[in-house]
Amino acid sequence: SGTTNTVAAYNLTWKSTNFKTILEWEPKPVNQVYTVQISTKSGDWKSKCFYTTDTECDLTDEIVKDVKQTYLARVFSYPAGNVESTGSAGEPLYENSPEFTPYLETNLGQPTIQSFEQVGTKVNVTVEDERTLVRRNNTFLSLRDVFGKDLIYTLYYWKSSSSGKKTAKTNTNEFLIDVDKGENYCFSVQAVIPSRTVNRKSTDSPVECMGQEKGEFREI
């Protein structure tokens, strides 16, 4: 139902990386505008992105209040210039989103190798602890703060002269690996949440190689 000149939104999709969360939908509006509402399963609806001609709405501020909650959003369609107009049932046309649980579903952003340091035949590789938009006591939490030991990193490392990738894993942000003396190595890391069944992995970090700026070499 609804007025003859509005169509319901469709293909409502959550796009979320490191808890930065945007709801997207179709169609591009023709003579209509949209308003979004979001709620937890047990909470009240909160309106966002009032009467917008966009087909996306940033809901990060709402979901970061409790990333372990499950959220539902809905997109209302109104005739442009006549937002008080309602459908034949006395309500504007709307469509529900799929449920979304940020902690379980947000994509892991591409990690970054912060540094690596070689001391003899050991290399310490450090992964940058990326800041999220999740707040606690007025400070932004890092990815590690939010996920704790649920988040691991896999390090892929290989001799510059070979193709086989060895792996190491850590539930901190640091790796300590053994390397062959006199060999240059390259590194890439991947963030993983092993307990998940979907959206388990990030994309790989940019590759960093020894002999380039980021690392430090010390002969002991």
């Epitope: 691991i152 896999t154 892929y156 894993k169 991947q190 069944t197 979907v198 388990r200 994309t203 790989d204």
Partner: antibody, heavy 120, light 107 residues
């Protein structure tokens, strides 16, 4: 239900080639690491190699390096083990296994295995 | 490569017995050790991960522990279905390596 099914085993002459398949269902291989492990008749388990289908990264045991190649087709949700220059000592049951990529790296699901016999 | 030395290679035990299998790593592997059970003609099954965590669906008579580079699998009260071969495995570094296996037979 998570399942891994190997196929492609059989009898092959020394120096010959064989391609094994590992078809996954109940999960997407892109999200995991897939290993191949073999077991010679009456012997223990020997790790062969792995692939991370999300980036194509691989690593092989020294005993098969340069002869075996692991690949994956994420659209088919299948991993492969291409075995070339086969030797008698490659005779074994070949298993594929899923690595959940936890810190300890355990293999939580295994296929039923496929027998490869290298003999003239 | 890290060697995993497993002992004993075989043992005979009776139903109800307490059985202990050990694995020694040639270097530090933290807790990155798993234990598997394999029955003839079947694929291995995961029992213990991270040295001491019981995998889902595995009976609580199985347990794992770590002391430095020594790892132990204990079956508190052996059941008829437990007669099988057991393997330890480290995945602290690539390549992952297995112990030689311990065959648990009926006395």
């Amino acid at each position: 239900e998570v399942q891994l099914v190997e196929s492609g085993g059989g009898l092959v002459q020394p120096g010959g080639s064989l391609r094994l398949s590992c078809a996954a269902s109940g999960f997407t291989i892109f999200d995991y690491i897939i290993h191949w492990v073999r077991q010679a008749p009456g012997k223990g388990l020997e790790w062969v190699g792995y692939i991370d289908p999300s980036n194509g990264y691989t690593y092989y045991a020294d005993s098969v390096k340069g002869r075996f190649t692991i690949s994956a087709d994420t659209s088919k949700n299948t991993a492969y083990l291409q075995m070339n220059s086969l030797r008698a000592e490659d005779t074994a049951v070949y298993y594929c296994a899923r690595d959940i990529q936890s810190v300890s790296g355990e293999f939580d699901y295994w296929g039923q295995g496929t027998l490869v016999t290298v003999s003239s | 490569d890290i060697q995993m030395t497993q002992s004993p290679s075989s043992l005979s035990a009776s139903v109800g017995d307490r059985v202990t299998i050990t694995c020694r790593a040639s270097q530090d592997v933290n807790t990155a050790v798993a234990w598997y059970q394999q029955k003839p003609g079947k694929a291995p099954k995961l029992l213990i991960y991270s040295a001491s965590f019981l995998y889902s669906g595995v009976p609580s008579r199985f347990s794992g522990s770590r002391s430095g580079t020594d790892f132990t699998l204990t079956i508190s009260s052996l059941q008829p279905e437990d007669f099988a071969t057991y393997y330890c495995q480290q995945h602290y570094t690539t390549p992952p390596t297995f112990g030689q296996g311990t065959k648990v037979e009926i006395k």
